[in-house]
């Protein structure tokens, strides 16, 4: 015979074809072998011109031989070489599917590989590719979009060889809160890292507000609305500034009375105050906290103390906010002017967290009376709020 070729090569099959001998022959003897593969020999009819090779090993170079027989006579042998395809990984599955994450797992191919190419694509056409190592059989997908259909494909690699792709389809779950109205809802969406987040007042996407979320203190889910830490920001500001807010949310800042009013109008909120000074820490929690609107001059409601700092906010309960240019306190003198800050002053303060940073003069500094008195300016202070029923919401999410 002549013209021996292979066609339709896969990872486990190939088709051998040849030109028949000119003379009539009784049969053809076909043999094929590969590295670490025992030789297989088959005899076929003399009028056959092709033979299906099966049960081949993947990614293996085979040597194929064929000769003709007529009675006791044998023709010369012709030879061809071919390499089977790399077989595909198997059983690609998406598990642990969340709103923004999923875990892909697969079984490796029979052939040795040098890696895998993973491709995942959303219905909007966003495609991402990643190459992972040869010993990997799972991969965590992150930064996915909620409520989105994805097609994930995987292909084995071995040098220049590439297997066929296999695929799986999955859909990420929807966010519990597509437009979180506070940091607790952001946390219940699965965001557990403290930092900047966008919240939506009353869940309205038109009312976006960038806030700093504390996701670690006492279970997390806190909107930080005041931070003092280094004295770089000027807190001796006017009414307009305190209404709107000022500063860098990552550093020292005040979120704004208008924002506090809108946030606390969304439901029942609790207040947490964290204080730190020369390695000492203290905290105060109030289970009822709200700030009125501009008509009430942002009247404070704060009740239900627990903690280690001492109940210094009770003195300010029911008071309107005061700044040097809008004196609403009950003192004859202007408390904000006297103490170079702003607060829900009475006459004047037990708490002066917006006082002069580092000023240890009586009542002038960052004070929390029942912790460090009025003659010590506290180094670090944060005020933050979250829904009073956060513990219940958190438990419900865990059960879900």
């Amino acid at each position: 015979p002549s013209g021996l070729v292979t066609a339709n090569i896969t990872d486990s099959e190939a088709l051998a074809r040849w030109q028949p001998a000119i003379a009539t022959v009784d049969s053809y003897v076909i043999s094929y072998t590969g590295e670490k593969v025992p030789e297989i020999t088959r005899t076929v009819s003399g009028n056959t011109v092709e033979y299906a090779l099966t049960d081949l090993e993947p990614a293996t170079e085979y040597t194929l031989r064929i000769f003709a027989e007529k009675g006791p006579q044998k023709s010369s042998t012709i030879t061809a070489k071919f390499t089977t395809d790399l077989d595909s990984p198997r059983d690609l599955t998406a598990t642990e599917v969340q709103s923004e994450t999923a875990l892909l797992t697969w079984r490796p191919p029979r052939a040795s590989v040098t890696g895998y190419l993973l491709v995942y694509e959303s219905v909007d056409g966003t495609v991402k590719e990643v190459i992972v190592g040869p010993d990997t059989t799972s991969y965590s997908l992150a930064d996915l979009s909620p409520s989105t259909h994805y097609t994930a494909k995987i292909q084995a690699l071995n040098g220049p060889l590439r297997s066929n792709m296999i695929q799986t389809i999955f859909t990420t779950i929807g966010l519990l809160y597509p437009f979180p109205k506070d940091c607790s809802q952001a946390m219940l969406n699965g965001d557990t890292t403290s930092g900047l987040y966008t919240i939506y007042l009353n869940g309205d996407k038109a009312e976006a507000l960038e806030v700093f979320c504390d996701m670690t203190s006492d279970g997390g889910g806190w909107i930080v609305f005041l931070r003092r830490k280094n004295g770089r920001e000027n807190f001796y500001q006017n009414w307009k500034a305190y209404a709107a807010g000022f500063g860098d949310r990552r550093e020292e800042f005040w979120l704004g009375l208008d924002n506090l009013n809108k946030i606390t109008a969304q439901g029942q909120y609790e207040l947490r105050v964290d204080l730190r000074d020369h390695g000492e820490t203290a905290f105060a929690v109030y289970d009822k906290f709200s700030v009125g609107d501009a008509k009430t001059r942002y009247k404070l409601k704060v009740e239900g103390y627990s903690g280690t700092a001492g109940d210094s906010m009770a003195y300010h309960n029911g008071r309107s906010f005061s700044t040097f240019d809008k004196d609403t306190d009950s003192a004859i003198t202007n408390c904000a002017l006297s103490y170079k800050g702003a607060f829900w002053y009475r006459n004047c303060h037990r708490v002066n967290l917006m006082g002069r940073y580092g000023d240890n003069n009586h009542s002038q500094g960052v004070n929390w009376f029942h912790w460090k008195g009025h003659e010590h300016s506290i180094q670090f202070a944060e005020m933050k709020l979250r829904p009073s029923n956060f513990r219940n919401l958190e438990g419900r999410r865990k059960r879900a």
């Epitope: 009740e303 103390y305 109940d311 009770a314 003195y315 309960n317 009950s330 003192a331 004859i332 003198t333 009475r346 006459n347 004047c348 303060h349 009586h362 009542s363 009025h374």
Partner: antibody, heavy 120, light 107 residues
Framework: QVQLVESGGGLVQPGRSLRLSCAAS????????MHWVRQAPGKGLEWVSG????????YYADSVKGRFTISRDNAKNSLYLQMNSLRAEDTALYYC?????????????WGQGTMVTVSS | DIQMTQSPSSLSASVGDRVTITCRAS??????LNWYQQKPGKAPKLLIY???NLETGVPSRFSGSGSGTDFTLTISSLQPEDFATYYC?????????FGQGTKVDIK
């Protein structure tokens, strides 16, 4: 309207004990801190002790610290002052007073007082 | 403890007079200062809290001022029912302390 009625006063020998009570009505008792203030015959006012609305924080004048204990039973709308190791100088009219808030702030409304006489 | 010193200890005045009583704290107390009136055989009555805030129901002839360490109670026009003993009290820190009292009697 707010009413505070003290009881439990009387004549007692030095070194003995006495327990004063104050029955409160006309307001949500556990929303307010309470005080004991005394006045020796012909003398001025002396703050003795105070307790927060929850009962979680208590405060004392140095002259009674370690001898007197303030407590409250919010379920019974009652304030108490347990006075041990009584001395002659503890002789006074003892007033209970309601604060304006839940923490130590301003004694606002006062009862009519109960007389304690320490004498042998 | 914070000492509270009132002056004068006593004063005689006539109906219609303007009367001023002062109170000095031994240390800075912001505006944590209250004034009480006590009549013989009666319990003290809160007149002014937070140095200058008139308690509900107290006549407007009573007024308070001051902050820090020096405070004043003023009765703008003394009435017959105002003859009594007046006490200042600091609520800045515990133990709370009272002044020794100022007795206002009829001249």
């Amino acid at each position: 309207q707010v009413q505070l009625v003290e009881s439990g006063g009387g004549l007692v020998q030095p070194g003995r004990s006495l327990r004063l009570s104050c029955a409160a009505s006309g307001f949500t008792f556990d929303d307010y801190a309470m005080h004991w203030v005394r006045q020796a015959p012909g003398k001025g006012l002396e703050w003795v002790s105070g307790i927060s609305g929850s009962g979680g924080s208590t405060y004392y004048a140095d002259s009674v610290k370690g001898r007197f204990t303030i407590s409250r039973d919010n379920a019974k709308n009652s304030l108490y002052l347990q006075m041990n190791s009584l001395r002659a100088e503890d002789t006074a009219l003892y007033y209970c007073a309601k604060d304006i808030s839940a923490v130590m702030d301003v004694p606002q409304t006062w009862g009519q007082g109960t007389m304690v006489t320490v004498s042998s | 403890d914070i000492q509270m010193t009132q002056s004068p200890s006593s004063l005689s005045a006539s109906v219609g007079d303007r009367v001023t009583i002062t109170c000095r704290a031994s240390q800075y107390i912001q505006g944590f200062l209250n004034w009480y009136q006590q009549k013989p055989g009666k319990a003290p009555k809160l007149l002014i809290y937070d140095a200058s805030n008139l308690e509900t129901g107290v006549p407007s002839r009573f007024s308070g001022s001051g902050s820090g360490t020096d405070f004043t109670l003023t009765i703008s026009s003394l009435q017959p029912e105002d003859f009594a003993t007046y006490y200042c009290q600091q609520s800045y820190s515990t133990p709370q302390t009272f002044g020794q009292g100022t007795k206002v009697d009829i001249k």
